[in-house]
């Protein structure tokens, strides 16, 4: 069976890394495990990994925004940032604003790698399933 | 044969959903049908679906912009928004501006699903083939 | 073996097209050659091609930004722009700013095609491996 995941925003995320809806809606999870915000790889190989995060706020103050996909493995002491997007000076002060960050690329992943998504400012994330998501598939 | 599509912007249309060039240029269409703006799935399975839209204008007034990929199937009463990007407060009032929205993710699609792209303001879309496109491929 | 590449930003790029790190870090290069900034296709077929570029600056002057993936083949007289992103009026004058451009789509590539990435303003690109990259894989 094809190893694939597409997880969508979960609005009761209260800490980092982001947590994801893994059951309802347009979710996919096959041949990959989901555990505490992370996608757990169980077969070494090449994977296309992607994520989109939708940031929005009522009154722009241009707080720097970052969106990272990173990897953790108990063999390594430190998280590895695989992909990252940053935004600064992106809206007009005081105005209602909205913006997305999209990341996607190919990586060689190893069994037991855990993949996560991090954002700089959780309160500015909108978790609609069509707007904020995290996924991968094995090539 | 691999089921794949890459359609590019078609500028002489004023209708929603967006219509696409399905014949000339860097277009691909194999094992998938194109009908009235939509990509029609004829084999159930996992697909990576993507779209980019290039918005631009002569004088910024920060009109809210949205870019959606949605699915329609005669079995279901309502369209399903698969992916969406929104932008608000994205340019400096009165200036010439330009911005892109990119969407891409994996979905489990069913034979006879129709996929479309919608935008909130057609007048602000530039249809160059390298800038505005819609595609998918079966994993 | 799967034909795949993921190249990351190389900060000593001084000219166009962009040059890439093809050896160290989270780089992948298998069944595809890298030559003077370009990915060289050696087997005709369908490829998903992607790139992200991270632009940033100390003081916004809204210099128009462009990010292109283009193709060159000795059989054709002119470069073919496959995908392009443009940004204008994207930050507040005088402020420190940061923004990304992401491109990704499917193309039918031919043996000996050379793929490159071009940007309008090299001095505004940040080359961190997680932020600026260029890749592809054969479907």
């Amino acid at each position: 069976l094809r190893k694939v995941a597409h997880l969508t925003g979960k609005s009761n995320s209260r800490s980092m890394p982001l947590e994801w809806e893994d059951t309802y809606g347009i979710v996919l999870l096959s041949g990959v495990k989901y555990k505490k915000g992370g996608l757990v790889i169980n077969e070494t190989g090449l994977y296309f990994v992607y994520s989109k995060v939708y940031f929005r706020g009522q009154s722009c103050n241009n707080l720097p925004l970052s969106h990272k996909v990173y990897m953790r493995n108990s063999k390594y002491p430190q998280d590895l940032v695989m992909m990252e997007g940053k935004m600064m000076s992106y809206c007009t002060t005081g105005q209602m604003w909205a913006r997305s960050s999209y990341l996607g690329a190919v990586f060689n992943l190893t069994s037991a790698d855990h993949l996560y998504v991090n954002v700089s400012e959780l309160s500015l994330v909108n978790f609609e399933e069509s707007q904020t998501f995290f996924g991968l598939y094995k090539l | 044969l691999r089921k794949v599509a890459h359609l590019t912007g078609k500028s002489n249309s004023r209708s929603m959903p967006l219509e696409w060039e399905d014949t000339y240029g860097i277009v691909l269409l194999s094992g998938v049908k194109y009908k009235k703006g939509g990509l029609v799935i004829n084999e159930t399975g996992l697909y990576f679906v993507y779209s980019k839209v290039y918005f631009r204008g002569q004088s910024c007034n920060n009109l809210p912009l949205s870019h959606k990929v949605y699915m329609r199937n005669s079995k279901y009463p309502q369209d399903l928004v698969m992916m969406e990007g929104k932008m608000m407060s994205y340019c400096t009032t009165g200036q010439m501006w330009a911005r892109s929205s990119y969407l891409g993710a994996v979905f489990n699609l069913t034979s006879a699903d129709h996929l479309y792209v919608n935008v909130s303001e057609l007048s602000l879309v530039n249809f160059e083939e390298s800038q505005t496109f819609f595609g998918l491929y079966k994993l | 073996l799967r034909k795949v590449a993921h190249l990351t930003g190389k900060s000593n790029s001084r000219s166009m097209p962009l040059e890439w790190e093809d050896t160290y870090g989270i780089v992948l290069l298998s069944g595809v050659k890298y030559k003077k900034g370009g990915l060289v296709i050696n087997e005709t077929g369908l490829y998903f091609v992607y790139s992200k570029v991270y632009f940033r600056g100390q003081s916004c002057n809204n210099l128009p930004l462009s990010h292109k993936v283009y193709m060159r083949n000795s059989k054709y007289p002119q470069d073919l722009v496959m995908m392009e992103g443009k940004m204008m009026s994207y930050c507040t004058t005088g402020q420190m700013w940061a923004r990304s451009s992401y491109l990704g789509a499917v193309f039918n590539l031919t043996s000996a095609d050379h793929l490159y990435v071009n940007v309008s303003e090299l001095s505004l690109v940040n080359f961190e491996e997680s932020q600026t990259f260029f890749g592809l894989y054969k479907l």
């Epitope: - | 002489n12 249309s13 004023r14 929603m16 007034n61 009109l63 303001e121 057609l122 007048s123 602000l124 | -």
Partner: antibody, heavy 119, light 111 residues
């Protein structure tokens, strides 16, 4: 900058036709609708119809019962509104306005053309 | 067709005061994304000028004392502190479907 310049005032007899022009500049003529809106003396605004110069498609307000025809000439970036079978109650200022296709608000207006229908 | 009803027909306000104009649609002009209502200002002998689009968005070049609100069928245009140049007729217009229709207008006059 965006400009819409209309033709001059007209005096017409009942039963005749009038054709008002609207020359656009400062933007891509084929990417926006041109709408026509009229205003009778001391009255409110009434939308008559639109044309999309990109493909020539048009839509009309049924209140005008086939009396109105809107056309566009891409080569000169000019839109035209022709109203036939004129009657005294058609005396009004006729405005052309650029409108965004989807949002359909009128963001730039011509200066107006007074059409007087009198015997 | 959707009928747009504005109230009051005339509003007498002193310079510096707040003005609140209402517009009611005979059926909803909102979707999940936007409310398709726009406000215009017209002065004698001039073409209308767009002030607010999609119920609450200020058009480029329009002073921040103008604001719009509402959804569904009830909409409001507010002028926070009337200036002499604001005395004019104001129209709402919907673009939810064809035909586009305008309200009959509210005249804001000096008290």
């Amino acid at each position: 900058q965006v400009q819409l310049v209309q033709s001059g005032a007209e005096v017409k007899k009942p039963g005749s036709s009038v054709k008002v022009s609207c020359k656009a500049s400062g933007y891509t003529f084929t990417r926006f609708d041109i709408s026509w809106v009229r205003q009778a003396p001391g009255q409110g605004l009434e939308w008559m119809g639109w044309i999309f110069p990109g493909d020539g498609s048009s839509q009309y307000n049924e209140n005008f019962k086939g009396r109105v025809t809107i056309t566009a000439d891409k080569s000169t970036s000019t839109a035209y509104m022709e109203l036939s079978s004129l009657r005294s109650e058609d005396t009004a200022v006729y405005f052309c306005a650029r409108s965004l296709i989807s949002t359909a608000m009128f963001d730039h207006w011509g200066q107006g053309t007074l059409v007087t229908v009198s015997s | 067709e959707i009928v747009m009803t504005q109230s009051p027909a005339t509003l007498s306000v002193s310079p510096g005061e707040r003005a609140t104009l209402s517009c009611r649609a005979s059926k909803s002009v909102s979707t999940s994304d936007f409310s398709y209502i726009h406000w215009y200002q017209q002065k004698p002998g001039q073409a209308p000028r767009l002030l607010i689009y999609l119920a609450s968005h200020l058009e480029s070049g329009i002073p921040a004392r103008f604001s719009g609100s509402g959804s569904g069928t009830e909409f409001t245009l507010t002028i926070s502190s009337l200036q002499s140049e604001d005395f004019a007729v104001y129209y709402c217009q919907h673009s939810r479907e064809l035909p586009r229709t305008f309200g009959q207008g509210t005249k804001v006059e000096i008290k």
